[in-house]
Interface confidence: low
């Protein structure tokens, strides 16, 4: 039903705590330069607004659209110029144009130091001094560093947070105790907003429907037990939680995404049995517990996919009534007899589906046409297969570091055009994905790869969005999302790429590498190799590989010499000309 | 795309010191060593000094040892040299590179001394 007061009713169902975290979320993620004190500043101002309007919803402004009671509070930073430029020109606009314009300039790379972890006895010293604000400060190092963090999670990673300081900070051992549950936090909350980046990138850049589909295979891998009417009604309330997160509306968000965790919990049994456990909890754990829920059983007897879709005769009158119900159908159905597949690969499956039916039911006899279409899609099925075989292969043979040197060396051949160190970093994120998903089990292996590889690209297709270097990224990026891996697995040595001349001084060392820890070593090396790919693209297996022993015995000897530098001085040049003539 | 800014140079006398600064950005600055080096008019490429990403190791050419200080703020993504003591032999473009490479990537800075 219609509020009076909108900020009055997200405060009385959020609580104050819940609400003074997103209120805090919403200004880090926007306002990503400003101090943590100006921030706390206005969140108290905010909150004792919506106290106002609890107590009197026909207060002044207490009506107006939560966004626009944020917009006004931005607009009145007298430094707002200053500090963000020409973010300060949206406030000219009208909402929601003006909500548009703030969304434009959120910075997914802003130019900030890395979020460092203090010593465990300074960490623990500050967070007994004052848990909340320790906290709030958390919730905005990570907000302005991830501006599209799913907002009601990251108040789940504090609460995990605040929960491992007060156990960790009264042992013996803080260090010990503090560590490894930081460590998991961190590397989860990383994969959560990853993930939350691509749910937006969906939505932004390819619309709902995309969405949709996404969270239609999503869910039917979950909930195989679930009818597609309980699947769409659950996707249609996601899309909407998403949609707001995305846009900034963290508060409906929340609330809506707490409304949406009771409902499931109101009808597991139609769902699935494994709700049990999740909604027994307080509800940010709720909510996050059906998040990362284990996939239900498989019902049994399921009937074979070609009955409904393939030998029935109303396909193509199914298909022009209805189409997009069809289709969500033939996903849904696909979907739950598949968990060991990628989203990618259903997406893809349902696509090449689609397209079949398009051109078949144009044709005279349209059974006779569509009657292979599943032997057709098959290798949509085998390249993904073949594809992480090959790579676990060749990543359980070299190693993490070798396999990353390999990912550098092919991707530079794909977009040499892209700087050395994002090619690097980017080659180092996708070795790391060997590491996570090549030691499953082979039917979770697929789905790990391509669902880890899609976030990655995604953070690959942001940036390069910003700064374009290479209209082959372009390409791949925008022209399908659900075929952005396969787009760039098919890129081969870019013909159009003129070599860089060679420049001895980006293959020149000293004997500050021999101090370097392991991983900037690494990254030196890797820099060192992209350089050398871009001046000899089409240098064979066998060449790069005599260059990089030759590269490794020179590193070992001139760091294990006496005089490192003289060694380094004299022989870096006969190691650069003995490159060259390797590389001939 | 990587973008390193160099400034600070100018003419002094000899004895005399400078802070040279070089802006980074378009990578994440804190993964890479850093490094100093120069150019003299009609020579080649020298290496001056490297820090490590963290900064905690630095590295500087015996010519200008215990005068030259690296130094660098992650915080900032910015680089430093101190120069002491200058001599009119360091007269010279500077540049900062990424890694202990011998490359220039920014426009360098350029440092007189002379009397």
């Known amino acids: 039903e219609a509020h009076k007061s909108e900020i009055a009713h997200r405060f009385n169902d959020l609580g104050e705590g819940h609400f003074k975290g997103l209120v805090l979320i919403t200004l880090s993620q926007h306002l990503q330069k400003s101090p943590f004190e100006e921030h706390v500043k206005l969140v108290n101002e905010v909150t004792d607004f919506a106290k106002a309007c609890v107590a009197d919803e026909s207060a002044q402004n207490c009506g107006k659209a939560i966004a626009t009671l944020f917009g006004d509070k931005v607009c009145a930073i007298p430094s707002l110029r200053e500090t963000y430029g020409e973010l300060a020109d949206c406030c000219a606009k009208e909402d929601p144009d003006r909500v548009e314009c703030f969304l434009q300039h959120k910075d997914d790379n802003p130019n900030l130091p890395p979020f460092e972890r203090p010593e465990p006895e300074a960490l623990c010293t500050a967070f007994k001094e004052n848990n909340d604000r320790f906290i709030g400060h958390y919730l905005y190092e990570v907000s302005r560093r991830h501006p599209y963090f799913y907002a009601p999670e990251l108040l789940y990673y504090a609460e995990k947070y605040k929960n491992a300081l007060t156990e960790c900070c009264e042992a013996a051992d803080k260090a010990a105790c503090l560590t490894p549950k930081l460590d998991a936090i961190k590397e989860k909350a990383l994969v959560s907003s990853a993930q939350q980046r691509l749910k937006c990138a969906s939505l932004q850049k390819f619309g709902e429907r995309a969405f949709k589909a996404w969270s239609v295979a999503r869910l039917s891998q979950k909930f195989p037990k679930a009818e597609f009417a309980e699947i769409s009604t659950i996707v249609t309330s996601l899309t909407k939680v998403t949609k707001e997160c995305c846009h900034g509306d963290l508060l409906e968000c929340a609330d809506d995404r707490q409304e949406l965790a009771k409902y499931m919990c109101e009808h597991q049994d139609s769902i699935s049995s494994k709700l049990k456990e999740c909604c027994v909890k307080p509800t940010l754990q709720k909510a996050h517990c059906i998040l990362e829920i284990q996939r239900d059983e498989l019902p049994t007897e399921l009937p074979d996919l070609a009955v409904d879709f393939v030998e029935d005769k109303e396909v193509c009158k199914n298909f022009a009534e209805a189409k997009d119900v069809f289709l969500g159908t033939f996903l849904y159905e696909y979907s739950r007899r598949h968990p060991e597949y990628s989203i990618g690969m259903l997406l893809r499956i349902a696509k090449g589906y689609e397209a079949k039916l398009e051109k078949c039911c144009a044709e005279a006899d349209p059974h006779a046409c569509y009657a292979k279409v599943f032997d057709e899609l098959q290798p949509l099925i085998d390249e993904p297969k073949k594809l992480v075989q090959q790579n676990c292969e060749l990543f359980d043979k070299l190693g993490e570091y070798g396999f990353q040197n390999a990912l550098a060396v092919r991707y530079t051949q794909k977009a040499p055009q892209v700087s050395t160190p994002t090619l690097v970093e980017y080659a180092r994120k996708l070795g790391s994905v060997g590491t996570k998903c090549c030691s499953l089990p082979e039917t979770e292996r697929l789905s790990c790869t391509e669902n880890y590889l899609a976030l990655i690209l995604n953070r690959l297709c942001i940036l390069h969005e910003k700064t374009p270097v290479s209209e082959r990224v372009t390409k791949c990026c925008t022209e399908s999302l659900v075929n952005r891996r396969p787009c760039f697995s098919a890129l081969h040595v870019d013909e159009t790429y003129v070599p860089k001349p060679f420049h001895a001084d980006s293959f020149t060392f000293h004997a500050d590498i021999c101090t370097l820890p392991e991983k900037e070593k690494q990254v030196k090396k890797q820099m060192a190799l992209v350089e050398l790919v871009k001046h000899k693209p089409k240098a064979s297996e066998e060449q790069m590989k005599t260059v990089m022993g030759d590269f490794a015995a020179f590193l070992k000897k001139c760091c294990d010499a006496d005089n490192k530098e003289a060694c380094f001085t004299e022989d870096g040049p006969k190691l650069v000309a003995k490159c060259q003539a390797t590389l001939a | 795309d990587v973008q390193l800014v160099e400034s600070g140079g100018g003419v002094v006398q000899p004895g005399n010191s400078l802070r040279l600064s070089c802006a980074a950005s378009?990578?994440?600055?804190?993964?890479?060593?850093m490094s100093w080096v120069r150019q003299a008019p009609g020579k080649g490429l020298e290496w001056v000094s490297s820090i490590s990403g963290s900064g905690s190791d630095t590295l500087y050419a015996d010519s200008v040892k215990g005068r030259f200080t690296i130094s660098r703020d992650n915080a900032k993504t910015t680089l430093y040299l101190q120069m002491n003591s200058l001599r009119p032999e360091d007269t010279a473009l500077y540049y900062c590179?990424?890694?202990?490479?011998?490359?220039?990537s920014g426009q360098g800075t350029l440092v007189t001394v002379s009397s």
């Open positions: 378009g990578f994440t600055f804190t993964s890479f060593g």
């Open positions: 590179t990424i890694g202990g490479s011998l490359s220039r």
